[in-house]
C-alpha cells in the first residue's frame, strides 16, 4: 500500500481543516488508514482522524481544531496499521479556504432596487470576520448568456443593484462566495443559490 498523491490540506481558519490524498489502488480509507495530527506546541498531544473514501483510491479527512492562530503548525502522519506511509506538516494560515457565506436573501420591496444580503460565516472574534470580501454571481434561469459577477470589496455583506440592470419579467438566481486577501486565501465554495422573479416598471419611452 502506497500513497500516490500526498495529502494536501486546507483550513477554514476556524475549526476544521480538510486533507485529501490518493492511494495507489482501491482503499477502504476508514478501516485501513489513520491520519494523526499534532499541533507543534508545548504539551500538545496527537489527535486521530478517521478518513472517509473520496472516490475509489481517494481519501479525505476532516481535522477538528480547537482554535487557530497565524503561528500554528501541525505535524501529519499517515498510518496503515503499524506502517508509516507518509509524514508531513501543515500550517493552516498558509492554506485557508474560507467558509461559504450563508442566508443569502434578495429584498425586492425597495423601489427599483434589488438589495442582496448574506451572513458573514465567521463569528466577530475570528480574525477573518473583518477581512472577507465577496463575489456575487447572478444569472438568468432562462438565458445562460445572462450571467454576471459583482465584486463586493467593502466589508458589509450586502449588494445593491438597480433592478433595471436585469431583464424584467424573468427569474434570476444569485449566489455568493468569499475570500480574504490578508491570508491570500482561495475562494470559498458558493453559498446555496436563491431565486427571485425580477419585475419592475419600465419607464415610458418618449418618442
Amino acid at each position: 500500500m502506497k500513497v500516490l498523491q500526498e495529502p494536501t490540506c486546507v483550513s477554514d481558519y476556524m475549526s476544521i481543516s480538510t486533507c485529501e490524498w490518493k492511494m495507489n489502488g482501491p482503499t477502504n480509507c476508514s478501516t485501513e488508514l489513520r491520519l494523526l495530527y499534532q499541533l507543534v506546541f508545548l504539551l500538545s498531544e496527537a489527535h486521530t482522524c478517521i478518513p472517509e473514501n473520496n472516490g475509489g483510491a481517494g481519501c479525505v479527512c476532516h481535522l477538528l481544531m480547537d482554535d487557530v492562530v497565524s503561528a500554528d503548525n501541525y505535524t501529519l502522519d499517515l498510518w496503515a496499521g503499524q506502517q508509516l506511509l507518509w509524514k508531513g506538516s501543515f500550517k493552516p494560515s498558509e492554506h485557508v479556504k474560507p467558509r461559504a457565506p450563508g442566508n443569502l436573501t434578495v429584498h425586492t420591496n425597495v423601489s427599483d432596487t434589488l438589495l442582496l444580503t448574506w451572513s458573514n460565516p465567521y463569528p466577530p472574534d475570528n480574525y477573518l470576520y473583518n477581512h472577507l470580501t465577496y463575489a456575487v454571481n447572478i444569472w438568468s434561469e432562462n438565458d445562460p448568456a445572462d450571467f454576471r459577477i459583482y465584486n463586493v470589496t467593502y466589508l458589509e455583506p450586502s449588494l445593491r443593484i438597480a433592478a433595471s440592470t436585469l431583464k424584467s419579467g424573468i427569474s434570476y438566481r444569485a449566489r455568493v462566495r468569499a475570500w480574504a486577501q490578508c491570508y491570500n486565501t482561495t475562494w470559498s465554495e458558493w453559498s446555496p443559490s436563491t431565486k427571485w422573479h425580477n419585475s419592475y416598471r419600465e419607464p415610458f419611452e418618449q418618442h
Epitope: F41, S44, E45
Partner: antibody, heavy 118, light 107 residues
C-alpha cells in the same frame, strides 16, 4: 462555570513532603493540559509544572525538578502536585491553572498556601 | 531559559489616562505571549492571549501587540479598577516564564 479548587496546603518543616490537589469542574477536564503556578509572598508569578491531557508530556521548572511530581486523574477531574524535600524558598501560594491550548492560562483557582518553616 | 523583562516596573497615572507596558523576551517567542492582571489577594486574570487577542469578557480598553521579542499592553482611558499589577508570560518553550510585573499606581 469553570471552577478550580486547590487544597492540601499548610505549614510543613523543611525536608518534609506535602501533596496538593486541585478539583476541576465546568469543563471537559481531559481535553486540556493543566499546570501549577506559584507566587511567593509579595513576589511575582513563577511557573512550577504542567502536564498534557493524558500525561504523555510533562514539564518542570528547574527549581523543582527531581523534588516535585505532577499528576492527574481524569476520572476524578483532579490535578495533583507531590512535593518532596521541601525548602523554605518553596513557601508560596500555589495556583492550579487550566491551559488554554495556545500558551496561556485562561482559568485559575484561588490558590492554596504552602509555608515551609521550622 | 527565556527571560521576560517588563518595563516599567511601576508607573503612575490618572483615571482616564492611556498607559503602555512593554515586555521584552530574551529570544524570539513568535506570538506566544499572554498578559494578566492581578489584584491584591486575587488570582491572576487573563487579559490578552497570543500577543493580541482580547480574552472573552475583557473590556476593549485593553489591547496587546507585538511579535518576536517586543510586546506591548496598552490600556486606554484608565478606570479606577485598573490600578493593579500586570504580568506578561511566554509559552514558546519550557520553562514557561513570567515577567517580573508592572505595578500601576494612581498619581
Amino acid at each position: 462555570e469553570v471552577q478550580l479548587v486547590e487544597s492540601g496546603g499548610g505549614l510543613v518543616q523543611p525536608g518534609r513532603s506535602l501533596r496538593l490537589s486541585c478539583e476541576a469542574s465546568g469543563f471537559t477536564f481531559d481535553d486540556y493540559a493543566m499546570h501549577w503556578v506559584r507566587q511567593a509572598p509579595g513576589k511575582g508569578l513563577e511557573w512550577v509544572s504542567g502536564l498534557s491531557r493524558t500525561s504523555v508530556s510533562i514539564g518542570y521548572a528547574d527549581s523543582v525538578k527531581g523534588r516535585f511530581t505532577i499528576s492527574r486523574d481524569n476520572a476524578k477531574n483532579s490535578l495533583y502536585l507531590e512535593m518532596n524535600s521541601l525548602r523554605p524558598e518553596d513557601t508560596a501560594l500555589y495556583y492550579c491553572a487550566k491551559w488554554g491550548t495556545r500558551g496561556y492560562f485562561d482559568y485559575w483557582g484561588q490558590g492554596t498556601l504552602v509555608t515551609v518553616s521550622s | 531559559d527565556i527571560q521576560m523583562t517588563q518595563s516599567p516596573s511601576s508607573v503612575s497615572a490618572s483615571v482616564g489616562d492611556r498607559v503602555t507596558i512593554t515586555c521584552r523576551a530574551s529570544q524570539d517567542i513568535s506570538i506566544w505571549l499572554a498578559w494578566y492582571q492581578q489584584s491584591p489577594g486575587k488570582a491572576p486574570k487573563l487579559l490578552i492571549n497570543v500577543a493580541s487577542r482580547l480574552q472573552s469578557g475583557v473590556p476593549s480598553r485593553f489591547s496587546g501587540s507585538g511579535s518576536g521579542t517586543d510586546f506591548t499592553l496598552t490600556i486606554n482611558s484608565l478606570q479606577p479598577e485598573d490600578f493593579v499589577t500586570y504580568y506578561c508570560q511566554q509559552a514558546n518553550s519550557f520553562p514557561i516564564t513570567f515577567g517580573q510585573g508592572t505595578r500601576l499606581e494612581i498619581k
